[in-house]
Interface confidence: low
């Protein structure tokens, strides 16, 4: 189990000719927000296919109105990460797709209206618990700078976030210098020693020896923080390519606010400002109402009278979850019966059946002979989904309709001749032979 | 399209009863019905989930909830309002609505979240 954190640095018009001067007309006012659909693998983009690793949704940014011929500024935009949590293991592959929405503020009937202003996408390759890793993608003339990481929950550990460490209460039988790993009691696991000297605080390894520099931070031994001048922005997690600075070890580090909380320090231990709709010791308690379109993958939110009232996310076929992010495997259920193939459409279940079955889940098993004649006097056989003719004499084939000749076989033993007879056949035996087949 | 049309209405005493229909030609996501008395705004009264995927979630407006009682017939493609207790202030011209876009945000006491409208049906609680 873990977290995948995404921190939107910037967005606004891109570099060239013909850009946007800004996102918001004079006439209205407006806010951006944000939100991230997460698949496994390298898989196919499409918004519409569902962000099986989770999805989420930023907070409202702060209401911006542009000044006509006042030169554009920096679009305002929320506060906190966009963190979407994953329960199984991290993929290592993924592909996502961030959508930045426009909120206008005008005097609609109904309510505020949403657009959508532009959807990134892309492929990506991330092992938990790395550093943060930067990224700039246009679209358009849109251009948005992000940031974004993997991180596991404790008690799960390494990059994929499925093995679990935590110290027994049991004295370890673990010898000097290694730290027990459930959940085999008696697995051990060395931890990795970094290069000697490798800064606690801003360092760290995935190979023994090694000293890789967190964010902010350089050196051999990632001891010396990066010039600060030429950051990008000054909020959220920073870049050693752009040289911000990441603050040292505090209550805050790893932000334990959710749902794009803030955190600041407080004397005894931390303190977390949250987002409209989330409350609770680290912001993990949603009121989140329909206003704030909190179902994805097609989940219809439903809200009743009160505008305060808690929100019930109805998902369609295939989904699950309180916001609908969840895939669900219905075939994992093995619904259909009779050995029947099972095909998630996600808009519905489809069950292929084997032969001689039918119905939707394959639980009619079909008489295979009704319909089915039998030529010249063969009789029908069911059985295993299918039906066969068990054929009169001299006949054979699928219906018994191929005249057989019966001595094609050569059914007489020890040299006896076969005639063809209306009955059945006849063989003459050679001297010293007898038997219907001239076995004796 | 969907084309919605409404049976039931009428005249009655206070504490009497009555039960509206609206059926409705394609399928729906959601219906339900809204109000409006003489010089007074429209008013949502009532909301029911249709689409199989819903299970006949009811919401209601707290002035009739205890005493409305909103129903569907799948097969039918009805949906049916139950008023019990009736009071003057009931009194209104009773119009159907439905849902038929696919959307991630739906708030049902939002007269523009309905696609389709029926024509209404006048109710008369007398004192």
């Known amino acids: 189990a873990g977290v995948f954190e995404l921190q939107i640095h910037s967005f606004g018009p891109g570099p060239g000719p013909g850009a946007p001067r800004s996102p918001c007309s004079a006439r209205l006012p407006c806010r951006l927000f944000f939100r991230v659909c997460l698949k496994p693998g390298l898989s196919e983009e499409a918004a519409e296919s569902p962000c099986a690793l989770g999805a989420a949704l930023s907070a409202r940014g702060p209401v911006y109105t542009e000044q006509p011929g006042a030169p554009a500024p920096d679009l305002p935009l929320p506060d906190g990460l966009l963190q979407v949590p994953f329960r199984d293991a991290w993929p290592g592959t993924f592909s996502f797709i961030i959508e930045t929405w426009r909120e206008e503020l005008g005097d609609q009937i109904g309510g505020p209206a949403w657009s959508l202003l532009a959807r990134v996408a892309g492929r990506r390759r991330l092992a938990a618990g790395g550093p943060w890793a930067r990224d700039i993608q246009r679209a358009g003339a849109w251009e948005l700078r992000f940031s974004y990481r993997a991180r596991c929950e404790p008690p799960a550990v390494g990059t994929a976030c499925t093995r679990l460490c935590r110290p027994r209460s049991a004295p370890s039988r673990c010898g000097p210098g290694l730290r027990p790993c459930a959940p085999l009691e008696d697995e051990c696991e060395a931890p990795l020693v970094c290069r000697a000297g490798c800064s606690p605080e801003h360092g760290f390894c995935e190979q023994p020896g090694e000293c890789r520099c967190l964010e902010g931070w350089t050196g051999p031994l990632c001891t010396v923080p990066v010039s600060t001048s030429s950051c990008l922005s000054p909020r959220g997690p920073s870049s050693a390519t752009t040289g911000c600075l990441v603050p040292g070890p505090g209550p805050c580090d790893g932000n334990p606010c959710a749902n794009g909380g803030s955190c600041s320090e407080t004397p005894r231990s931390f303190e977390c400002t949250c987002p409209r709709g989330f409350y609770g010791l680290r912001c993990e308690v949603s009121g989140v109402t329909c206003a704030d379109g909190p179902c994805f993958n097609g989940g219809l939110c439903v809200g009743g009278a009160d505008p305060d009232s808690a929100y019930i996310c109805h998902c369609p076929p295939g989904f699950q979850g309180s916001n609908c992010e969840k895939r669900v495997d219905r075939c994992s259920l093995q619904p259909c019966r009779n050995g029947g193939l099972c095909l998630d459409l996600g808009h519905a279940l489809r069950c292929r059946c084997r032969a001689g079955f039918a119905g939707p889940r394959c639980e009619h098993d079909l008489d295979d002979c009704a319909g089915r004649a039998c030529a010249n006097g063969g009789t029908c056989v069911e059985g295993g989904g299918a039906h066969r003719c068990s054929c009169a004499l001299g006949f054979g084939g699928r219906d018994c309709r191929e005249r057989a000749d019966p001595c094609a076989a050569r059914p007489c033993a020890h040299g006896g001749r076969c005639y063809a007879h209306f009955s059945g056949l006849v063989c003459a035996c050679a001297p010293g032979y007898m038997g219907a087949r001239c076995e004796f | 399209q969907v084309h919605l049309v409404e049976s039931g209405g009428g005249s009655v005493q206070a504490g009497g009863s009555l039960r509206l229909s609206c059926a409705a030609s394609g399928y729906t996501y959601f219906m339900g019905w809204f109000r409006q008395a003489p010089q007074k705004e429209r008013e949502w009264v009532a909301t029911i989930g249709t689409g199989d995927i819903f299970n006949g979630a009811a919401y209601y407006v707290d002035s009739v909830k205890g005493r409305f009682a909103i129903s569907q017939d799948n097969a039918k493609n009805t949906v049916y309002l139950q008023m019990n207790s009736l009071k003057p202030e009931d009194t209104a011209v009773y119009v159907c609505?439905?849902?038929?876009?696919?959307?991630?945000?739906?708030?049902?006491?939002?007269?523009?979240?309905?696609?389709?409208w029926g024509q209404g049906t006048q109710v008369t609680v007398s004192s």
């Open positions: 609505a439905a849902v038929q876009s696919k959307s991630s945000n739906y708030v049902l006491r939002d007269a523009s979240t309905y696609n389709y």
